[in-house]
Interface confidence: low
């Protein structure tokens, strides 16, 4: 099941704006109507693991399906990070990453994807319906969250599959620019569409609007964008609580952590030239499952020159599920 | 470009080691995993191990205990040793990385390892 | 560990041809299968990943699809240069595991 935030409201554009090139009018409908097929938003989904050799292990992964470079991710408990949670580790692809007690490791596994494992008993161990959350921070995208918790039948040692969570959240003053022009496209063409099929010789004028072709498609809803932000976040039952966490992870991180507030993943970062990108930058794009992946090493077109894809700090777990968190 | 090539002894007796040595360009060690798949003649090909950009390593449990794979950085190398060869490891020994997290992304041509007195 | 099956060892199909090869995992994999090319000459690329993915400089002509244990991987119009073998591998539990190839020939 796909899961997607709901296009933000527009205020339909004036009537008129038809355009008023007799026949070629349908050209620009059929432009947006490209457009809109391509477009869309971008999804997080959180798996959530009981590990069977320890039952009071788990494993968290989080993952984001979009088309822009990461600047951060937190992975939080007990709710969303901004409202209640409490941050058990925040993943930057260049400066590092930091951990709290009860995570033990936290790793990337993939350029768009981390895993966390959560071990620990007493007032700080995770239980079966706790509620995890991860947040990731995108350029050009934005923030967008998700939250999963294990499901209450699940066997030990199983999990499931890693589909996008049913709580999906994002700021929307990072949906903007390609985002923005595709979406502001998409109302136009349905109301154009709506006029055309109530008016079948409409009355021409001018034309006041040029909507620019997208550097770079973003990712189009496979259904009409909606439940998403409708979907309250999940109950979480407070006997399951952490306590604050606020012992750092004997592996702290480097100095830049310090100033670093649990919320810095509320607002994109513009990334940093990251290094060692492994594969030329030939801004080819592979049209799949509804968008578009920046595939091994291709730059995205709206990252600008000095934004390079970035490496794992820690080396990609490539594509391997939940396997080989150790 | 990402290029990976795979240099090994060709032949190796019962009972003794093997190394071969991956040597990559195109992109750091430290920020990607390498992993070790072989293919005996005419059959399929088996995961060995896999070494991760901090270094860690993942084995394959069914050999394991005869399994080493270390990196060097600085080199652009990854080893892969192998101890007690029989010769049913006889076969074509790859590396392959996972560049920008996709499994196996990229392949070496492979190094052909003959087990044999 | 778990066991990938591909059924149909050899397949001979003609230029042009639609050629589906299937794999089948002995347990949910997640979609974490990913399909690879294997030439004569020894030569493997990696063509699908993560069920429906195609990687970087792969023909459109190929697809993959399926959910759960079982998957399958479609080459819409066969080509001289698709000559080859063909292997999935589930990337969802270690060890990582491969199926037994399907080798496809010419009519």
């Known amino acids: 099941m796909r899961t997607e935030a709901q296009v933000p409201a527009l205020q339909p554009p004036e009537p008129g704006l038809e355009g008023a090139m007799g026949h070629r009018t349908l050209v620009l409908p059929w432009v947006l109507l490209t457009l809109c097929v391509t477009a869309g938003t971008p999804e997080v989904w959180v798996q959530v693991r009981m590990e069977a050799t320890e039952l009071s292990s788990f494993t968290i992964r989080c993952g984001f399906l979009g088309s822009g470079s990461i600047s951060l991710v937190t992975v939080s408990w007990g709710g969303p990070n901004g409202a209640g949670g409490t941050t058990l580790a925040v993943l930057h692809p260049e400066r590092g990453i930091r951990q709290w007690a009860p995570a033990r490791q936290a790793r990337w596994e993939t350029q768009s994807s981390i895993s966390l494992i959560l071990e620990g008993s007493g007032a700080s161990s995770p239980c079966a319906n706790t509620t995890f959350c991860c947040k990731f921070a995108s350029f050009p995208e934005g923030s967008w969250e998700a939250c999963g918790s294990l499901p209450p039948s699940s066997d030990p040692g199983l999990s499931a599959p890693p589909t996008p969570a049913p709580i999906l959240r994002a700021d929307l003053a990072g949906i903007l620019g390609v985002s923005g022009v595709l979406l502001f496209g998409c109302v136009y063409l349905l109301h154009l569409l709506r006029r055309h099929k109530h008016r079948p010789a409409p009355r021409l004028q001018p034309s006041r609007t040029s909507p620019q072709a997208p550097r770079a498609r973003a990712w189009a809803p496979s259904q009409a964008s909606q439940a998403a932000l409708h979907v309250p976040y999940a109950t979480i039952n407070t006997s399951c609580r952490p306590a604050t966490l606020d012992t750092a992870h004997p592996h702290g991180g480097p100095s830049w952590w310090a100033s670093l507030p649990t919320h810095a993943a509320h607002r994109p970062q513009g990334p940093a030239a990251w290094a060692s990108t492994p594969i030329p930058a030939r801004g080819s794009f592979v049209s799949v499952e509804n968008g578009l992946y920046a595939q091994a090493g291709e730059r995205p077109p709206h990252t600008g020159p000095g934004l390079t894809l970035f490496p794992d700090p820690r080396g990609p777990r490539a594509m391997e599920g939940p396997l080989g968190v150790r | 470009q990402v290029q990976l090539k795979e240099s090994g002894p060709g032949l190796v007796a019962p009972s003794q080691s093997l190394s071969i040595t991956c040597t990559v360009s195109?992109?750091?060690?430290?920020?990607?995993?390498i992993k070790w798949v072989r293919q005996p003649p005419g059959k399929g090909l088996e995961w060995l191990g896999t070494i991760w950009g901090d270094g860690s390593t993942d084995y394959n449990s069914a050999l394991k205990s005869r399994l080493s794979i270390s990196k060097d950085n600085s080199k652009s190398q990854v080893f892969l040793k192998m101890t007690s060869l029989q010769t049913d490891d006889t076969a074509r020994y790859y590396c392959a990385s996972d560049s920008l997290g996709i499994t196996f992304g990229y392949w070496g041509q492979g190094t052909l390892v003959t087990v044999s007195a | 560990d778990i066991q990938m099956t591909q059924t149909t060892s050899s397949l001979s199909a003609s230029l042009g041809d639609r050629v589906t090869i299937s794999c089948r995992a002995s347990q949910d994999i997640s979609n974490y299968l990913n399909w690879y090319q294997q030439k004569p000459d020894g030569t493997v690329k990696l063509l699908i990943y993560y069920t429906s993915r195609l990687h970087s400089g792969v023909p459109s002509r190929f697809s993959g699809s399926g959910s759960g244990t079982d998957y399958s991987l479609t080459i819409s119009n066969l080509e001289q240069e698709d000559i080859a073998t063909y292997f999935c591998q589930q990337g969802n539990t270690l060890p990582l595991t491969f199926g037994a190839g399907t080798k496809l020939e010419l009519k």
């Open positions: 195109g992109f750091s060690l430290s920020g990607y995993g």
